[in-house]
């Protein structure tokens, strides 16, 4: 639009002046005036600001508390926050990853559809007909029943979703 109907994108209005915002990684020390420019200062160690801003204080980097099962995935900079993830075998309880819980195991009769990551839990699925799982595991998929035929054996005991079939020798034909 012409003429302008607001301050420019990286500016803010204060005391009739359109002042420059501080760039990411810096905080506001003093507003611009008719005589002076906006004064900004870099954020300190372990602090950040991730947007153009007029904040007088930088934000503290997130602390990845090992007591909560957390570890640093990506170290923060003056422009970005620290990113936490969970220790091996654990996953975040929320998107913000403020604490961790142990990966769930899939009970017998269920197999792992998707192995857990640092941010998502194990996904289990019931073993369909022809498959079984006889252990509680965070890694094991449903296994197919043993094929007795390929071993020249016969099914002696039918399989379930928790047990494999039991194979045995074929009955001898009587004379």
């Amino acid at each position: 639009p012409e003429p302008p109907t607001a301050c420019r994108e990286k500016q803010y209005l204060i005391n009739s002046q359109c002042c420059s915002l501080c760039q990411p990684g810096q905080k506001l020390v003093s507003d611009c005036t008719e005589f002076t420019e906006t004064e900004c200062l870099p954020c300190g160690e372990s602090e950040f600001l991730d947007t153009w801003n007029r904040e007088t204080h930088c934000h503290q980097h997130k602390y990845c508390d090992p007591n909560l099962g957390l570890r640093v995935q990506q170290k923060g900079t003056s422009e970005t926050d620290t990113i936490c993830t969970c220790e091996e075998g654990w996953h975040c309880t929320s998107e913000a990853c403020e604490s961790c819980v142990l990966h769930r195991s899939c009970s017998p009769g269920f197999g792992v559809k998707q192995i857990a990551t640092g941010v998502s839990d194990t996904i289990c699925e019931p073993c369909p007909v022809g498959f079984f799982s006889n252990v509680s595991s965070a890694f094991e998929k449903c296994h197919p029943w043993t094929s007795c035929e390929t071993k020249d054996l016969v099914v002696q005991q039918a399989g379930t979703n928790k047990t494999d079939v039991v194979c045995g020798p074929q009955d001898r034909l009587r004379a």
């Epitope: 012409e2 003429p3 302008p4 109907t5 607001a6 301050c7 420019r8 994108e9 990286k10 500016q11 209005l13 009739s16 002046q17 359109c18 002042c19 420059s20 915002l21 501080c22 760039q23 420019e37 906006t38 900004c40």
Partner: antibody, heavy 125, light 107 residues
Framework: QVQLVQSGAEVKKPGASVKVSCKAS????????MYWVRQAPGQGLEWMGW????????TYAQKFQGRVTMTRDTSISTAYMELSRLRSDDTAVYYC??????????????????WGQGTLVTVSS | DIQLTQSPSFLSASVGDRVTITCRAS??????LAWYQQKPGKAPKLLIY???TLQSGVPSRFSGSGSGTEFTLTISSLQPEDFATYYC?????????FGQGTKVEIK
Amino acid sequence: QVQLVQSGAEVKKPGASVKVSCKASGYTFAGYYMYWVRQAPGQGLEWMGWINPDSGAPTYAQKFQGRVTMTRDTSISTAYMELSRLRSDDTAVYYCAREKIYYGSGNYYPSFDYWGQGTLVTVSS
Amino acid sequence: DIQLTQSPSFLSASVGDRVTITCRASQGISSYLAWYQQKPGKAPKLLIYAASTLQSGVPSRFSGSGSGTEFTLTISSLQPEDFATYYCQQLFSYPWTFGQGTKVEIK
């Protein structure tokens, strides 16, 4: 303090291109629009257009459309104005100027509060 | 494009004189007008913006007035350092045009 320092004088042949630089210091470069104005010898001032240093988006005066390119490098707080297919009547001093905006009576009033020292571009065969 | 016509184009005056320069716009521009001073071989310097607001650091002998199509720049008591060329600029409609200039010379 705010300073806009431009590149040195250039002599070019008709049909050639020239690229003038304008290095800003003393303020947040991406926070203020940068304008280009030229002045032919003994003549008045002519507005050429502007660039938003944050996004890099330029706006050109109709007269220069197709011949002028305004760019910037935020890493070195420098704006550039390139004029192509030069003619003898492009001989002029080229200025960069920073926009300031004042708010009063419900309106936003722009003006050019800081200017570069000027770059003389001479086009001669 | 909006045309700005300054009058006079040349002006001879003495130190201490009150000087008035007029700038007329070809159409209404509200208060979107600035005044600049330019000395030979130098870049223009902002004096007045929003038609009547004095730029910081500019002596109070300079003043601006007007709105719509007619504007004036007044120097209440001309000083030796004021001998220069003065330009008005409209910032209402692109392209942001300038007046042709008024040269203030020593009488």
